[in-house]
């Protein structure tokens, strides 16, 4: 059945080389004395991307990251020596790794770094206006970075700066044991989560922090922290990780007698991202890696996208789950987790919940308390001993929208763009991996808007070497994606419509919401453009309906490439054909000489099918004829290539090989009539490769071909031998390069 394509593979897979060659990636490959380009701050108004790294802070131009300014902010030699004496690694630890980079006000950023295991913060002046072109460190104003940045660069930090106050989830000690959610800066005493209570935080790894309004009253604003942590004893058998969402009220100032300078409104709930399995055993993706909030229309109800991986070392998998804030709030209004002692199971709390309900922000909206310091003792006592909710937050549709389990990589980052298409709005996900690739995925509703189909549009390699992607930002203004890793920063456009192909069908099959067929090319779709002229079908990707009136038009890549190749009796030949789309299925037809009838090629000992094409072994005269390579995708059939194979019997072979190129042997002439000069050269080369007694290796042979090719080029400057590159490609393949043929500009490869 050719109707079903391979939906789990990316339609297009682009190597770093291909990305560079097609001008689809710009890379900043880092400085020799820096690394760890992990902390991003996007400023759309100034058109800058600020990046915190090792001993440096960068300001990149969003248009082209090759244009940047930098601030050098290392630690003193004394501090570095102290760090070294404490047994830390001089290169990987005893430096200033920037962990916090936030907009402080209209003119300044606030930055914090590890400071060689002595956290430090300062302000960076950026000026009032972009044209001020100011980017400098306030050298006179350094602050203690404790509770803001971790000591250890390996530890994750989540932070948020609002109204002059910094909310941070980090480790506040040298040993990396005292994890807390802090509020520092501002005019108030710092506030933190309870110390020495694993029910509050249990060795957490903080991911991100976000301010989300609860109502129209700013007093109800909450800060949500996303993190993963060790499951509490009794919550799970054995050692397990749980993904969490934690909440605190922005106007929480701690308790009066108990929980003094500690959060009184902290609550946390588990985030579930799992796939239902057989026997009721679900496959859980518990290792939360990244979170993206899609704010659309209602800022009180963003959609939360979470990237998760599995905890198991045996079974490696990744998933993306979507959560609604209404579901999150419902859980925080549900039962609290409770247990009577360390040996008891966790149960939903059944007793009387004090008023006002713990976790509620003091405001006029939900009760008459002006401050958390006024909260009754029983509320504080309850809050202190019941920080966790009993019910977890389940994803929308109760399952992930993207799952990857059969690959050698895991997801690390996500950003999402909402795109207007002809048939509605689509969320396009850009997912970063631990091997330096970015997946472009669109979730497409099937029957209902909740039943989603994931379509993997592209897999792009954005760094030269495999390196985990640790930061991603998306500029809707510039329509660009910015990616950070240990090695550097990369920039790529959100869409590359032209690479899908030169035909309406190819554009339609891509199902990329950014792209549509404009009558002559696959180009960026704008909802404002005249609908009549735009062909796009994201939901179904059906070219038969949307491009049917264009099928007669052969100017847009519909006419297949035609090739004639020659094979020698009893030898083997390879008919190369691999479609641009990885999702297309290829099938071959054979048409005997002087026959109309085409038959589908069946694979046997004589014919071997590979991803790159068809290998015909031990050629016979009966194999002569036309070979048609078809790509089938989503019900649409496209003929990519027509190869005419001529099988030469062995008795004519010697005669052919010993004839000079210009000789007038009738057989040679007959064969040469249909051949271009470059094909003749190629054919001769090929025959030599098969039969030459003195060439032991292909390398030796290629060497000879290239030498002759260079000689010919010197003699005939106007001549471009069409197949001189042929052997080069063979050699590259020999080296193990995974290449797909997108065009058929070369003579088919023969073995």
């Amino acid at each position: 059945n050719y109707q079903n394509g391979k939906n789990n593979v990316p339609r297009l897979k682009l190597s770093y080389k291909e990305m560079l060659e097609s001008n689809n990636v710009i890379t900043f490959n880092g400085l020799a004395n820096s690394s760890s380009y992990h902390t991003f701050l996007l400023d759309e108004e100034r058109s800058r991307l600020y990046v915190g790294a090792k001993d440096h802070i960068f300001s990149f131009d969003l248009v082209n990251i090759k244009d940047f300014q930098k601030i050098v902010w290392p630690v003193s030699y004394t501090r570095r020596d102290e760090c070294k004496w404490a047994g830390k690694d001089i290169l990987k630890e005893c430096a200033n790794f920037i962990k916090v980079l936030k907009a402080y006000n209209q003119t300044h950023l606030y930055a914090c770094g590890t400071g060689a295991f002595h956290p430090i913060c300062t302000y960076i002046e950026i000026g009032h206006h972009p044209e001020d072109n100011i980017f400098k460190l306030e050298n006179s104003h350094f602050e203690n970075g404790r509770g803001k940045s971790p000591y250890d660069p390996k530890l994750l930090t989540a932070s948020l700066l609002i109204d002059g106050e910094l909310y941070s989830g980090t480790a506040a000690d040298f040993m990396g044991r005292d994890f807390a959610i802090f509020r520092t800066l501002g005019h108030h005493h710092p506030i933190r989560t309870e110390q020495h209570d694993s029910r509050w935080l249990n060795d957490p790894k903080f991911i991100s922090a976000h301010l989300i309004s609860e109502s129209d009253n700013p007093e109800d604003d909450k800060v949500y922290f996303f993190f993963r942590e060790n499951a509490i004893d009794g919550e799970h058998s054995g050692k397990a990780t749980h993904a969490r969402i934690g909440q605190i009220c922005k106007n929480d100032f701690g308790g009066h007698r108990s929980l003094v300078n500690k959060w009184t409104t902290f609550l946390k709930a588990r985030l579930i991202c799992s796939v239902p399995g057989p026997n009721g055993i679900d496959t859980h993706f518990d290792e939360l890696q990244d979170v993206f909030l899609m704010n659309f229309k209602d800022p009180k109800n963003p959609v939360v996208y979470g990237v998760f991986t599995t905890s198991s070392n045996i079974f490696k998998g990744s998933a993306v789950c979507m959560y609604s804030m209404s579901d999150v709030r419902r859980v925080f209004l549900g039962p609290y987790a409770h247990r009577d002692g360390p040996n008891y199971q966790w149960v939903p709390y059944q007793g009387r919940v004090p008023y006002p309900r713990p976790g509620t922000c003091p405001s006029k909206t939900f009760g008459g308390f002006d401050s958390t310091k006024d909260l009754p003792d029983d509320v504080i006592t309850f809050a202190r001993s019941h920080p966790a909710m009993y019910n977890p937050v389940f994803p929308m549709n109760n399952r992930p929208i993207v799952i990857k389990t059969d690959v050698n990589y895991q997801f690390t980052q996500i950003v999402v763009d909402r795109v207007d298409a002809e048939d509605g709005q689509y969320d396009v996900m850009f997912i970063g991996t631990d091997v330096g690739t970015v997946l472009k995925v669109v979730s497409i509703p099937k029957e209902t808007w909740y039943d989603l189909e994931e379509v993997l549009l592209e897999e792009m390699t954005v760094f030269r070497e495999p390196t985990a992607i640790s930061a991603m930002e998306l500029s809707t203004k510039q329509q660009q994606l910015y990616i950070g890793s240990t090695a550097g920063v990369a920039q790529l456009p959100l869409h590359r419509c032209d690479i899908y192909g030169k035909a309406c069908a190819e554009c339609c099959l891509a199902r990329d919401p950014y792209c549509a067929w404009d009558g002559s090319a696959c180009s960026r779709y704008f909802p404002t453009a005249k609908r009549r002229t735009r062909r796009q079908d994201i939901r179904n990707g059906d070219p038969l309906t949307h491009c049917s009136d264009l099928h007669h038009d052969n100017h847009h890549g519909h006419s297949p490439e035609e090739r004639i190749i020659y094979g020698v009796e009893n030898s083997s030949t390879f008919l190369e054909c691999s479609p641009k789309s990885q999702r297309a299925l290829v099938y071959w037809q054979f048409q005997r000489r002087n026959e109309e009838r085409k038959e589908e090629i069946r694979v046997d000992d004589h014919i071997i099918r590979t991803d790159q094409g068809l290998l015909l072994r031990s050629l016979q005269q009966k194999d002569s004829g036309n070979y048609l390579c078809h790509a089938v995708e989503h019900g649409f059939i496209q003929t990519l290539l027509k190869v005419t194979l001529e099988v030469i019997d062995t008795e004519h072979l010697e005669e052919l090989l010993h004839k000079d190129d210009d000789g007038d042997g009738s057989k040679t002439k007959e064969m040469s009539n249909s051949m271009t000069p470059s094909q003749k050269v190629w054919y001769r080369d090929f025959m030599q490769l098969i039969n030459h007694p003195n060439l032991n290796t292909m390398d030796e042979f290629c060497e000879q071909v290239w030498k002759r090719d260079r000689k010919q080029r010197r003699q005939r400057p106007g001549h471009t031998p069409g197949n001189s590159n042929k052997w080069k490609h063979l050699q590259e393949n020999k080296k193990g390069r995974n290449r797909r043929t997108h065009e058929f500009e070369r003579a088919p490869r023969s073995v």
């Epitope: 295991f117 404790r146 509770g147 506040a172 040298f174 040993m175 209570d197 694993s198 029910r199 006592t381």
Partner: antibody
Framework: EVQLLESGGGLVQPGGSLRLSCAAS????????MNWVRQAPGKGLEWVSG????????DYADSVKGRFTISRDNSKNTLYLQMNSLRAEDTAVYYC????????????????WGQGTLVTVSS | QSVLTQPPSVSGAPGQRVTISCTGS?????????VHWYQQLPGTAPKLLIY???NRPSGVPDRFSGSKSGTSASLAITGLQAEDEADYYC???????????FGGGTKLTVL
Amino acid sequence: EVQLLESGGGLVQPGGSLRLSCAASGFDFDSYEMNWVRQAPGKGLEWVSGISWNSGWIDYADSVKGRFTISRDNSKNTLYLQMNSLRAEDTAVYYCARSGYSSSWFDPDFDYWGQGTLVTVSS
Amino acid sequence: QSVLTQPPSVSGAPGQRVTISCTGSSSNIGAGYDVHWYQQLPGTAPKLLIYGNSNRPSGVPDRFSGSKSGTSASLAITGLQAEDEADYYCQSYAGPNPYVVFGGGTKLTVL
């Protein structure tokens, strides 16, 4: 007024056991972390053990680990230290102290101390 | 051997100013942790004198002040009085093992 009153000290032979108590009053006992700190005759102060308000966190100095056990009864406003396998070097005045966490960075300080109880380990 | 190093003794005449130093390492004071100071009058329990490097609890005279820089801290006493004769201890957080550390103590003698 915050008051901490230790009891249970005395003379004990090496290898013996003692249980110290600290009765607390004048504050919400169940809201505070509590500690035992000792001082050998003519020597400095040494932190011995600490316990969080709900006993969820308990820690000991290496010198007493495995021999001493700290506990608390919030309903009785009392802190305990069970000392087993006592050695001569455990001879000291044992103070009960409350963690104040008065500083900005929540680094433990001891804002209130009891008068101490003397433990003598000798044969 | 204490983790925090203090001079065993200091002395001064009434009305004079004395300072007591407390030196740690990059994993306690040098890690940015707060330093607290205690006064122990002869035959009594220690009393919190300075918390969080430089803050005085209510009831402590302003003659006592604390400061911290890098891996060390110091306690300054101005206008020395006879009743200030006592042992003074510095203390810092140290992470999990041990939880807190004390200095060896400094005996202040008012001449």
